[in-house]
């Protein structure tokens, strides 16, 4: 690395990967290993972080980027740049304190994580349940009651789910 | 910074003690929950321990009995005080923030086995 020149300040000559070592006379240095600068100009290069524990390497630290991490099996992220993990529950549970609970009949989770959710109301919208609801899945809903009489033809596709509320606990 | 310290671990024969230190820094100790956890290479990473903020503890049903947690806050320690250890309590053992449910690892790691 050239030592910069500038008539301001040396140091805003240093890329992103290099820091300003005042040690060396304000010369442009690369970041020590497991270390990191993703913008230039900077005195001293950040330490990487470390994927250990429940945390796996989801991106590897480079010299001018950190390391980005996700969850071991049976946890997802939680928190911006996944600053925790959240145990994992099964389709048809919610996680509350006392850990992973079957949905409350009328309610619905079709994934790991998150909260039980009430079956559309397919009468809203005018229509019937064409297929039931369980833990896992919402119900569907089909024509509505009228469509059914006789002479009525085509079966109208399900109305997207509503925004949902919390599930009662 | 967070900074999670862990140490303590070693090898000790079944039914013997150890007791796991975690030096913790970066954040303001006092107010967080921590805890411990332990990953043995190919299974799911356990829960083990948690003491909330004013000291109350909470243990997996398989340590209950047996390991015993505690935090110092004047030096921002969490221990983890393991008697009766069996084989199975051999892993990888973290200093945890939060709670039972939701938390993250941010230290190295110290290993415990359980050997004869």
């Known amino acids: 690395f050239e030592r910069t020149r500038s008539l301001q300040d040396p140091c805003s000559n240093c890329p992103a990967g290099t820091f300003c070592d005042n040690n060396r006379n304000q010369i442009c240095s690369p970041c020590p290993p497991n270390s990191f600068s993703s913008a230039g100009g900077q005195r001293t290069c950040d330490i990487c972080r470390q994927c250990k524990g429940v945390f796996r390497t989801r991106k590897e630290c480079s010299s001018t980027s950190n390391a980005e991490c996700d969850c071991t099996p049976g946890f997802h992220c939680l928190g911006a740049g996944c600053s925790m993990c959240e145990q994992d529950c099964k389709q048809g549970q919610e996680l509350t304190k006392k850990g992973c609970k079957d949905c409350c009949f009328g309610t619905f989770n079709d994934q790991k994580r998150g909260i039980c959710r009430p079956w559309t109301n397919c009468s809203l919208d005018g229509k019937s349940v064409l297929v039931n609801g369980t833990k896992e899945r919402d119900v569907v809903c089909g024509p509505s009651p009228a469509d059914l009489s006789p002479g009525a033809s085509s079966v109208t596709p399900p109305a997207p789910a509503r925004e949902p509320g919390h599930s009662p606990q | 910074q967070v900074q999670l310290v862990e140490s303590g671990g070693g090898l000790v024969q079944p039914g013997g003690s150890l007791r796991l230190s975690c030096v913790a820094s970066g954040f303001v100790f006092s107010t967080v929950t921590m805890g411990w956890g332990r990953q043995v290479p190919g299974k799911e990473f356990e829960w083990v321990s948690g003491?909330?903020?004013?000291?109350?503890?909470d243990y997996a049903d398989s340590v209950k009995g047996r390991f015993t947690i505690s935090r110092d806050n004047a030096k921002n320690t969490v221990y983890l005080e393991m008697n009766s250890l069996k084989s199975e309590d051999t892993a990888e053992y973290y200093c945890?923030?939060?709670?039972?449910?939701?938390?993250?690892?941010w230290g190295q790691g110290t290993q415990v086995t359980v050997s004869s």
């Open positions: 003491v909330s903020s004013e000291g109350i503890t």
């Open positions: 945890l923030i939060g709670g039972r449910w939701s938390f993250g690892t």
